[in-house]
Interface confidence: low
């Protein structure tokens, strides 16, 4: 069980971004547990007045792909694909800068919402980043 595996996404919360594509999960139970937690997080986001349209347009799919990473089809063993670091940084430092500051200072939000740490992601030019999940965030000039 500790090796992880790939399974079709069966949830609802992220279906419009992931469809029924194959996602990486570490255990049989994990998809359902994450689905419950991300549904609660999205319910909280929906009632928040602190989320701008420009942020939510990309933050929501980014959170979905962070919670349910696509399987790396190029790998011989089950492996999750990372978010792209350049997009993660633009999301955190430009599009959602105010929202991130608010979220990181609010324990209730942090309890529900799992924010990617961009520094944990592979550098853009590294081999590990070659197959990263791209959300389609416009790159800043």
């Amino acid at each position: 069980e500790e090796d992880g595996f790939c399974q079709p996404y069966r949830g609802i919360a992220c279906a419009r971004f992931i469809g029924n594509r194959t996602v990486y999960m570490e255990s049989l139970h994990m998809q359902g547990e994450i689905e419950n937690q991300i549904t609660a997080a999205f319910t909280m986001i929906g009632t928040s007045s602190h989320l701008s349209d420009k942020c939510s347009q990309f933050a929501i799919p980014s959170l979905c792909h962070y919670a349910f990473p696509y399987c790396d089809e190029t790998s011989s063993v089950p492996k999750p694909r990372d978010l792209c670091r350049d997009e993660c940084e633009i999301l955190e430092n430009v599009l959602c800068q105010t929202e991130y500051i608010f979220a990181r200072s609010n324990p209730m939000i942090l309890m529900r919402l799992k924010l990617p740490n961009c520094e944990d992601l592979p550098q853009p030019e590294s081999p590990e980043a070659a197959n990263c999940i791209r959300i389609g965030i416009p790159m800043a000039d």
Epitope: E2, D3, G4, Y24, E26, S27, M30, E33, I34, Q37, Y66, A67, P69, K79, P80, K114, P116, N117, D120
Partner: nanobody
Framework: EVQLVESGGGLVQPGGSLRLSCAAS????????VGWYRQAPGKQRELVAR???????YYADSVKGRFTISIDNSKNTLYLQMNSLRAEDTAVYYC?????WGQGTLVTVSS
Amino acid sequence: EVQLVESGGGLVQPGGSLRLSCAASYYISRFYAVGWYRQAPGKQRELVARISSGGWTYYADSVKGRFTISIDNSKNTLYLQMNSLRAEDTAVYYCNARNLWGQGTLVTVSS
């Protein structure tokens, strides 16, 4: 080579608390998920709790509401806070990251 070293086990009375630690010799959050397993005498090893790099958690039904798993990335350490301990929680607790295992730490719950 990555090593996992558990600590924090011991003898505790029913209803008591313990906090297990698992120190990794590597940046622990680069594993997709890490977790705690346990093995009671004469029983199979079972998953207790698991946390993914995004902070998503899974708990076995028998420990839900009593145990809390967490990570401190700055210390490369995984924790298991165990409250309201019961006799049936007695086991050797193992830290796990993919195919890596710690040596285990014994938790004994007895009056």
